[in-house]
């Protein structure tokens, strides 16, 4: 099944986020992603648990899932890189870098997202925009077209309260409030973009989505640099 | 290594008002809630209030309202709990904790003995 | 606020006993996220409270799994499958799912 959902959203401009990337297992939307570079696509390394025997590949330049759109194309995956220190058991170093077949053909509807590298916190109260293809209500309705929330950053303290993840959230995580608009499991992979910058990606562990006391996780992309510009060298 | 070390025993007199420290290492003091307990001799565990690091958000059980304020100095990466008005029921061990995961972080505790 | 009643109030036992300890609430200490909040903590003599179980029935990283936690709803349960020396102390149970947070009167653990 997919892993993550945007709740409580709406429907995206479409191709007004040219570096959002459906990862697919068997032709079927699985994860979010995000375009980082000509070749590779940023995602969360517990998408590819369950993948071990598909085909996954990457979509990009669409809106729709379903629906014929110029700018579409499905590309093979040469490499996939999840981040050494990531585990199933943990959210820690949820990140995966998937590497295309070939350079994306880059035009308006498909462009790579800047990525911060500046290892400081986002602002609590900052909104930011996380979309996704994920599944749009608890009754598990599945989109086609890409949606997309408002979130607005908590601080780090709330969101290792006992009632909240009591601890989990180290410095190399952030958390989005997620009073019934939240991002969730299939979502995962997924851009968090703060100012036009990609500051954390949607991490895949389960958790109920929704609920105020339990915020959306990200992983901090800045905490990561060094680990990606490695693998993309 | 997360420590957690609290100011040293107070020996005050009814009336006045005594602030003591709870100072973190071993973390950053801005990720995680830091909570007071008090402890009478011989007694259980009562929880005072907790405070927001980041913001200096309170909160208090009721029945501390007015007797304890809870601040921080995120420079020091210090908190602080002023209790006033002391009476000789104010005597006890004060504890800070940090909240998540639980209070698995604990001071050493300050003895404030009120008296005469 | 929610009370927590502990029994017994001191439980002798022999080295290598098991021991099991009762706490209860006078209401539900489920919280509106679906979590129970009841934890165990144990105080030696002259020193803070440890915490050995969270939510119920998790251990604490480092605590032996000599101890286990159970129950739901307001009546729970600390036991300890084989008791040792180090062992010895106040326990405390905890409930942080409502305003204000609240200890139970512990329980003194002791040698018989």
């Known amino acids: 099944p997919p892993r993550g959902r945007i709740l409580g959203g709406r429907e995206a401009e479409a191709h007004a986020r040219p570096y959002m990337a459906s990862v697919q297992l068997n032709g079927a939307h699985l994860c979010g992603g995000v375009l980082v570079a000509e070749q590779w696509v940023l995602s969360a390394a517990h998408c590819l648990e369950d993948a071990a025997d598909g085909k996954v590949q990457v979509l990009l330049g669409a809106h729709s899932l379903s629906q014929p759109e110029p700018s579409k194309r499905l590309y093979d995956v040469l490499r996939a890189v999840p981040h050494p220190d990531s585990q199933p058991d943990t959210i820690d170093h949820d990140l995966l870098l998937l590497q295309l077949s070939e350079k994306a053909t880059l035009g308006p509807a498909v462009r790579p997202l800047p990525w911060q590298r500046v290892d400081r916190d986002v602002a609590p109260g900052t909104l930011c925009d996380v979309a996704g293809w994920g599944i749009v209500n608890h009754a598990g309705r599945r989109p086609d077209s890409l949606q997309h929330v408002l979130l607005p950053v908590l601080d780090r303290a709330t969101c290792n309260r006992r009632t909240h993840h009591d601890g989990a959230i180290t410095e190399r995580l952030m958390c989005a409030e997620s009073n019934r608009r939240d991002s969730c499991k299939g979502d995962s992979g997924g851009p968090l973009v703060c100012g036009g910058v990609l500051e954390g990606v949607v991490t895949s562990g389960s958790r109920v989505c929704g609920n105020r006391k339990k915020p959306g996780i990200y992983t901090r992309v800045a905490s990561y640099a060094a680990w990606i510009d490695s693998v993309l060298a | 290594e997360v420590q957690l070390q609290q100011s040293g025993p107070e020996l005050v007199k009814p009336g006045a008002s005594v602030k003591i420290s709870c100072k973190a290492s071993?973390?950053?003091?801005?990720?995680?809630?830091k909570n007071w307990m008090r402890q009478r001799h011989g007694e259980s565990l009562e929880w005072i209030g907790d405070?927001?690091?980041?913001?200096?958000?309170?909160s208090y059980n009721q029945k501390f309202r007015g007797k304890a304020t809870l601040t921080v100095d995120k420079s020091s990466s210090t908190a602080f709990m002023e209790l006033r008005s002391l009476t000789s029921e104010d005597s006890a061990v004060y504890y800070c904790a940090r909240e998540g995961p639980s209070f698995a972080y604990w001071g050493q505790g300050t003895l404030v003995t009120v008296s005469a | 606020d929610v009370l927590m009643t502990q029994t017994p109030l001191s439980l002798p036992v022999s080295l290598g006993d098991q021991a099991s300890i009762s706490c209860r609430s006078n209401?539900?200490?489920?919280?509106?996220?679906?979590?129970?909040?009841l934890e165990w903590y144990l105080q030696k003599p002259g020193q803070s409270p440890n915490l050995l179980i969270y939510k119920v029935s998790n251990r604490f990283s480092g605590v032996p799994d000599r101890f286990s936690g159970s129950g739901s709803g307001t009546d729970f349960t600390l036991r300890i499958s084989r008791v040792e020396a180090e062992d010895l102390g106040v326990y405390y149970c905890?409930?942080?799912?409502?305003?204000?947070?609240?200890f139970g009167g512990g329980t003194k653990l002791e040698i018989k």
């Open positions: 405070i927001n690091p980041n913001n200096g958000d309170t």
């Open positions: 209401q539900t200490i489920v919280h509106s996220n679906g979590d129970t909040y």
């Open positions: 905890f409930q942080g799912s409502h305003v204000p947070p609240t």
């Open positions: 071993g973390y950053t003091f801005t990720d995680y809630y």
